[in-house]
């Protein structure tokens, strides 16, 4: 019969700077029922608030919907674990939504072999930014990365595409089936997961010669 162990807020992520979610790891439970609560205040304010939504992000999480999310404001948060023996607090975590964005993967990945008559053949890759990201406002600059490999190969070949949403690759092995994926990252923030793989069969007559 002990108080709960110290919890730890280990991750906060936002898909688009409009909402965000934080997750914590419970400490030891002390062998008793344990309640967790996340409290926060915004930098420069003293008023403490409790997590508005413990459900959306799954177990041991707090989700901040649009009405609770402000850009350019630092959130200072901590988790309190309580049982009948007492309470333990996580360390405070400072969160700026600008720096925790992890977008969804890019969408509509399309891959095509192009074989112009007068030029070298190439692999043409095209995609769309994730739906939740509004690039028109200028709030976001998304950077893209492509990876591809022959189906049975162990190593991925990685290409940085910058801000463009299409890319050409010239050097491929004829007759091989390739897997292609793309991911994106805001200027400040985290890489998205890789998009689902798209497969493309490279024709046997695909030539790499000049």
């Amino acid at each position: 019969q002990l108080p709960p162990g110290k919890p730890e807020i280990f991750k906060c992520r936002s898909p688009n700077k409009e909402t965000f979610t934080c997750w914590w790891r419970p400490g030891t439970d002390g062998g008793l029922p344990t309640n967790y609560s996340l409290t926060y205040h915004r930098e420069g304010e003293t008023l403490m608030h409790e997590c508005p939504d413990y459900i959306t992000g799954g177990p041991n999480s707090c989700h901040f919907g649009k009405q609770y999310t402000s850009m350019w404001r630092t959130y200072i948060m901590m988790v309190n674990a309580t049982n009948q023996m007492g309470s333990s607090f996580s360390d405070e975590l400072y969160v700026d939504v600008t720096y925790i964005v992890q977008p969804d993967p890019p969408l509509e990945l399309a891959v095509e072999v192009k074989q112009p008559e007068d030029r070298k053949p190439y692999l043409w890759i095209k995609w769309s930014p994730p739906t939740l990201i509004d690039l028109k406002t200028g709030w976001f600059t998304l950077l893209y990365e492509i990876r591809l490999k022959p189906e049975k190969a162990a190593e991925w070949e990685i290409h940085f595409a910058g801000q463009q949403t299409e890319f050409k690759i010239l050097s491929l092995h004829p007759g091989q089936k390739y897997l292609v994926q793309v991911r994106c990252k805001p200027d400040h923030g985290y890489w998205s997961a890789w998009s689902p793989a798209t497969f493309i069969q490279i024709p046997s007559d695909f030539t790499m010669n000049d």
Partner: antibody, heavy 117, light 107 residues
Framework: QVQLVQSGAEVKKPGASVKVSCKAS????????ITWVRQAPGQGLEWMGW????????DYAQKFQDRVTMTTDTSTTTGYMEMRSLTSDDTAVYYC??????????WGQGTLVTVSS | DIQMTQSPSSLSASVGDRVTITCRAS??????LAWFQQKPGKAPKSLIY???SLQSGVPSKFSGGGSGTDFALTISSLQPEDFATYYC?????????FGQGTRLEIK
């Protein structure tokens, strides 16, 4: 009201075992557990270990690890402490205690275990 | 294991006196400290938990203080029923440990 009622005094021979019970009432037994503390004659309090009625977890003081078993029975809201291989050094009053709202807020009346040949 | 050292081990005082018993932990116990009163032939009674919080039904003449490793129990105006043995206990980590006790006697 909350009550912890312990079984009666026991006299045991060295090498024997003893099983002390602690019947709980007046609170939700399954959200807590039973802790055991002993007190040798004229000595201080010594924590022995505990058994959780919430998740079945047990923790024992190293000194007792090999010869004590603590259990809780949620159907009868009773905690048990069994000690084996008794010696005269185990002569003591054995208390059960629990956590209802605050740490160790309720105690049993104590059970005197005398180990004598 | 966390050692709990109480002082003094015994104390003589008169009715109406204010007395303080101290307890030192061998390492930081995050204020997970309790104080118990025990009278001869009786079970311990919890007075204070979390270093300074009064258990329900305990008179306010008992107060606890301190933090980190150094703690104290103060009885503001001794009454005859307060003469007993007092124990501190840490419940920050296993094994839970008690101080050796302070016997409070009538002078």
């Amino acid at each position: 009201q909350v009550q912890l009622v312990q079984s009666g005094a026991e006299v045991k021979k060295p090498g024997a075992s003893v099983k002390v019970s602690c019947k709980a009432s007046g609170y939700t037994f399954g959200t807590s557990g039973i802790t055991w503390v002993r007190q040798a004659p004229g000595q201080g309090l010594e924590w022995m270990g505990w058994s959780s009625a919430y998740n079945g977890k047990t923790d024992y003081a190293q000194k007792f690890q090999d010869r004590v078993t603590m259990t809780t029975d949620t159907s009868t809201t009773t905690g048990y402490m069994e000690m084996r291989s008794l010696t005269s050094d185990d002569t003591a009053v054995y208390y059960c205690t629990t956590v209802v709202r605050r740490p160790f807020d309720f105690w049993g009346q104590g059970t005197l275990v005398t180990v004598s040949s | 294991d966390i050692q709990m050292t109480q002082s003094p081990s015994s104390l003589s005082a008169s009715v109406g006196d204010r007395v303080t018993i101290t307890c030192r932990a061998s390492q930081d116990i995050n204020n997970f400290l309790a104080w118990f009163q025990q009278k001869p032939g009786k079970a311990p009674k919890s007075l204070i938990y979390a270093a300074s919080s009064l258990q329900s039904g305990v008179p306010s003449k008992f107060s606890g203080g301190g933090s980190g490793t150094d703690f104290a129990l103060t009885i503001s105006s001794l009454q005859p029923e307060d003469f007993a043995t007092y124990y501190c206990q840490q419940y920050s980590s296993y094994p839970i440990t008690f101080g050796q006790g302070t016997r409070l006697e009538i002078k």
